[in-house]
């Protein structure tokens, strides 16, 4: 932190020492408490980190995340015949990403225009709620997917309606849980006018009363309950999965599955290392430093970590790719600008010419393919 006359910089949810209690007018009406922004805070709010770096990253996330997750959701809902538990979890993962990413144009505009929020209090709260909601939804659905992948290897039994219903029930429970845990983000006033900068910030400036105690406790609880515990479950599932795959007999098909499983594990590990661990760790450290020392020395790291956490919306499609045969086909053909139907017809035509007596493994009238679970 840059040395200043007033030591009240509070970081993102930056700032916010309220020097004294809220004022009470003669009519007994409490005037809205105002928030501390000092020289350091003002530098951050006008600096290149928030006005250049963040919008660049968010633009990349939006450009990559919106079409890839949009296509994934479409594939899982309309192009996958059997709704396996994995499909259900991935569909929810894609939906969570979409619900977060659709607001990014507002977020990008906000940062480009010097952290000036012009879209109203309600939209700011929605943006912040969805921002954190997406991160915690992603962690939980990724955990479900990881445990389910392990379960499939342990119990390679056929798809049952009961398993799909359980997956739907778990998914609904996750959405409800995330809605409940993000309520504080919707309730708290997130927009604050900063006169010196002539800007209205969204989430970047919050009152100290909220910050010091409540914010630390809030994010610590989330880090333990919605990050550490699911992370432990995910890690356990993959460790056990690797053990199982190592000990199993290897034919050509099993080798393919093993390689895909390893790629999936590496992708999820990358997501934890890039997106979830730094953001959750720094959320706790950042608010702990504010609580204990009155200022955060890790503010820049914290901003970068929170920004990188949004990259999960770009990494999730790789998970779909390694898990879903359907998504793989659609992704490959989307990149090659071909329709799946055309490819299927070509494959059918080739197959019928080569093996006229053998039945084709694909149906030309259907775009559905057998998914490997």
């Amino acid at each position: 932190t840059i040395q200043g006359t007033n030591r009240s910089s509070k970081g993102r949810s930056l700032i916010g020492k309220v020097d004294g209690t809220s004022h009470v007018t003669g009519k007994g009406v409490t005037v809205e408490t105002v928030f501390s922004v000092d020289e350091f805070s003002a530098s951050v709010l006008t600096g290149k980190l928030t006005t250049v770096f963040l919008p660049i990253v968010y633009t990349i996330v939006f450009v990559v995340g919106l079409p890839s997750n949009g296509m994934a959701l479409w594939v899982f809902l309309f192009r996958t015949k059997k709704k396996h538990p994995a499909v259900i979890y991935m569909a929810n993962l894609a939906l969570a990403d979409l619900l977060s990413v659709i607001w990014f144009p507002l977020k990008i505009a906000y940062h480009i225009h010097g952290n000036n929020w012009i879209y109203g209090e309600a939209l700011c709260n929605v943006l912040i709620g969805f921002f954190y909601g997406n991160m915690y939804c992603s962690i939980l659905f990724m955990t479900c997917l990881s445990v389910q992948r392990y379960w499939v290897i342990v119990n390679p039994m056929g798809h049952s309606r009961k398993k799909a219903n359980i997956a739907i029930g778990i998914s609904l429970a996750i959405w409800l849980l995330i809605l409940l845990v993000t309520i504080p983000l919707y309730v708290v006033k997130q927009t604050i006018f900063i006169p010196a900068l002539n800007i209205t910030t969204c989430h970047d400036v919050l009152p100290e009363q909220l910050l010091v105690g409540d914010m630390f406790n809030y994010f610590l609880s989330l880090a333990i309950g919605v990050f550490l515990f699911p992370a432990f479950l995910t890690a356990s599932a993959y460790v056990l999965m690797i053990r199982m795959l190592r000990s199993s007999a290897m034919d050509e098909n099993s080798e393919k599955k093993r390689k895909r499983a390893i790629k999936l594990i590496v992708t999820v590990l990358a997501m934890y290392l890039i997106c979830f661990t730094p953001s959750n760790l720094l959320l706790v450290v950042h608010y702990f430093l504010i609580k204990s020392q009155g200022q955060s020395h890790v503010y820049a790291l914290y901003i970068v970590a929170l920004c990188l956490s949004t990259l999960n919306s770009c990494i999730d499609p790789f998970v779909y790719y390694f898990v879903s045969h359907d998504f793989r086909d659609h992704a490959k053909n989307a990149l090659l600008c071909r329709s799946v139907r055309t490819v299927k017809q070509m494959q059918v035509s080739l197959t019928s010419k080569k093996h006229s007596r053998k039945s084709s493994s694909y149906s030309s009238s259907s775009t559905t393919v057998k998914t490997s679970y």
Partner: antibody, heavy 121, light 107 residues
Framework: EVQLVESGGGLVQPGRSLKLSCVVS????????MTWIRQAPGKGLEWVAS????????YYPDSVKGRFTISRDNAKSTLYLQMNSLRSEDTATYYC??????????????WGQGTLVTVSS | DIQMTQSPHSLSASLGETVSIECLAS??????LAWYQQKPGKSPQLLIY???SLQDGVPSRFSGSGSGTQYSLKISNMQPEDEGVYYC?????????FGGGTKLELK
């Protein structure tokens, strides 16, 4: 001890230009916003221009916008005010201030002794 | 622009007396108000910021209050060194504006 010393004032004809300087000492210059405030003879105070500690953002009232330019050289701990197209109503003592940003606003905490600018033909 | 109107234009006070200067903003300024003192032939100095916060080194006999559009500066136990012109300033909306000033003299 915080010190701000303005210079560059004097008599100038209308339409001409003048550049004021403010050399500071006693504090880390690049940590603070700086402002120019003027006071016409026997009159009240008028805010002229403000600049952020990095120099990246500047703020002006409509009365001087497009004519005056505030800038800073953090290496030299010096604040500048370039005044172009001067008018008789710009006649005033120009003060350089070191600001405090508290609760998101600018408060003029330390003032220089001022430099007199007289615009007259 | 936000207009700042100070009253009275001038006043005299005896030693030890308590005096009050008012400042009215043309619109609500959410407590973003400062008070400055300018002694004859000197530069102004900050007394109070954010309506009621005392600047470092300023005697505690100076106090500020108010909210919305109405603010006041109170000087209890008037001293000879308190003579001068007092200005209010709003830091809520650009352009920053000042009141016309209140001249305080010792009786």
């Amino acid at each position: 001890e915080v010190q701000l010393v303005e210079s560059g004032g004097g008599l100038v004809q209308p339409g001409r230009s003048l550049k004021l300087s403010c050399v500071v000492s006693g504090f880390t210059f690049n940590n603070y916003w700086m402002t120019w405030i003027r006071q016409a003879p026997g009159k009240g105070l008028e805010w002229v221009a403000s600049i952020t500690n990095s120099g990246g953002n500047t703020y002006y009232p409509d009365s001087v916008k497009g004519r005056f330019t505030i800038s800073r050289d953090n290496a030299k701990s010096t604040l500048y005010l370039q005044m172009n197209s001067l008018r008789s109503e710009d006649t005033a003592t120009y003060y350089c201030t070191r600001d405090r940003i508290i609760r998101g606003s600018t408060w003029f905490a330390y003032w220089g002794q001022g430099t007199l600018v007289t615009v007259s033909s | 622009d936000i207009q700042m109107t100070q009253s009275p234009h001038s006043l005299s006070a005896s030693l030890g007396e308590t005096v009050s200067i008012e400042c009215l903003a043309s619109e609500g300024i959410s407590n973003y108000l400062a008070w400055y003192q300018q002694k004859p032939g000197k530069s102004p100095q900050l007394l109070i910021y954010y309506a009621s916060s005392l600047q470092d080194g300023v005697p505690s006999r100076f106090s500020g209050s108010g909210s919305g559009t109405q603010y006041s500066l109170k000087i209890s136990n008037m001293q000879p060194e308190d003579e001068g012109v007092y200005y209010c300033h709003q830091g809520y909306k650009y352009p920053w504006t000042f009141g016309g000033g209140t001249k305080l003299e010792l009786k």
